[in-house]
Amino acid sequence: ESLGWDIAELQLNHTGPQQDPRLYWQGGPALGRSFLRGPELDKGQLRIRRDGIYMVHIQVTLAICSSTSTSRHHHPTTLAVGICSPASRSISLLRLSFHQGCTIASQRLTPLARGDTLCTNLTGTLLPSRNTDETFFGVQWVRP
Amino acid sequence: ESLGWDIAELQLNHTGPQQDPRLYWQGGPALGRSFLRGPELDKGQLRIRRDGIYMVHIQVTLAICSSTSTSRHHHPTTLAVGICSPASRSISLLRLSFHQGCTIASQRLTPLARGDTLCTNLTGTLLPSRNTDETFFGVQWVRP
Amino acid sequence: ESLGWDIAELQLNHTGPQQDPRLYWQGGPALGRSFLRGPELDKGQLRIRRDGIYMVHIQVTLAICSSTSTSRHHHPTTLAVGICSPASRSISLLRLSFHQGCTIASQRLTPLARGDTLCTNLTGTLLPSRNTDETFFGVQWVRP
């Protein structure tokens, strides 16, 4: 572990209430193929414990979705990954809209610091699939 | 190699017969920019040779495709990446539907064990492009 | 640095003139969360300074975009990442069309050599968003 290979892959636990756009994550071998090796979960949000550059990746699939269901909503369904705390470091890192699709998937490299908590905000009225092969979120430390 | 940096990037060789949804892959410098350094191919399927956590990534583009061609089919075209053998470890790791798009691309971290064979199943009537910049599949060992 | 952990994450600076499909990138802490650690920029194009296998990733979001705007154009908007110089090594590495979506995102492993310059060509009449959480391009050295 001293090599700094912090890594996590999480599965969806649940969505927050109507006024909370955050997705709540869970991880651990007992749950399937998710795991936390270094980072930790704080009330379903991922907290970084080691400074460095990380590869952040996410895939979210909407449940009961068709091209029409994503396009007919007035407010497009959007997924944003960002640092939500500490407030002084709050920033959006990655943002995608579903438009006429039912899945978004992306990844990026970004510097993260110990204590950064990442939030994944899903705005819109559609809920995500909890199938572990359709919705997941992970980070991988890649260098100091 | 003893560092355990197993890595592979494959290009599409061919699709299977009608009742076999698997894509068959190939790799090697003679074929272009694909390669296998550690993992191996068994009848076009990727077999892992070292335990660890891997980043698995894939992009598949449908040939002769337009938004209408993906949306007008009764059964949506879907791509699933999973462990298909040994049977005791069979599981779907990554799944995406094309909906009104012609390309899917995603990635995830997952634990894999020596002997795991990964299959990429494309269900539906549309065929994938074999252009090496449009359809590819790879794994990268990232930590024990 | 001697470990060879070359890495870069870039944000969009600007698009080229009409007859130049290339996107022009910029990076550095003063600009936000982009950075160059090893690779360098040459007139907005990313140049590799160390041989190896790299993970190349990109996300491009079209500005002022809706499903209809991407689908109603005769020539679909396409993004291609390739080696554009030296000419002897020119090749397309990664290609995606937007079809009815407004964002493309993908990644792949590919061998790159010192001196390779990567170009990201966006063809079509739609322009990309310069929001740093919507459009970005990066590479990560992963092994010799």
Partner: antibody, heavy 119, light 107 residues
Amino acid sequence: EIQLVQSGPELKKPGETVKISCKASGYTFTNYGMNWVKQAPGQGLKWMGWINTYTGEPTYADDFTGRFAFSLETSASTAYLQINNLKNEDMAAYFCAREEDYRYVFNYWGQGTTLTVSS
Amino acid sequence: DIQMIQSTSSLSASLGNRVTISCRASQDISNYLNWYQQKPDGTVKLLIYDTSRLHAGVPSRFSGSGSGTDYSLTISNLEQEDIATYFCQQGVTLPLTFGAGTKLEIK
């Protein structure tokens, strides 16, 4: 203890207006949206929509646009349902309901307000 | 809109019996299915959410199961206080929709 306490039964004539209140206690009112549910006599439950208690933005189900209005008195931790130009088919019990941790799962319900519409 | 069908409007059972109430959705709702109990006095309580998760304080004789479009609520050992009407609700997308209810009576 979290509670949603609704105003008492109402007897109204067709064409009149009614305003039903739902007073919340035991939590920070602006942290959770307030939903409204209708139950006609002998019928099932029908979701009417919800109001964002932080922004005040209402969302109405298709059958409840026009004559129906959700509003707030944040300082009193109270949500309101107003129905204008009452019709016979508005005769029902109306419930306010609130989520806890999970989207669209209603952990807390008001006791209901019975509205009778009769000429 | 997603329709929620509770085909049995009323059900009679003896105390101590095992009772199962079913609910069908007009399309796959990915286990976003909740059950509520409405007592004769009109009070409504959450029993089960996400198909099978028991809400805090609800007796363990209540359980839920199902997937896709078909779901059920089971009371393993019927008690007098369980006499009520039970509603299913899909919580996967707006507008939220409920079943018509199943009224449980003592035989």
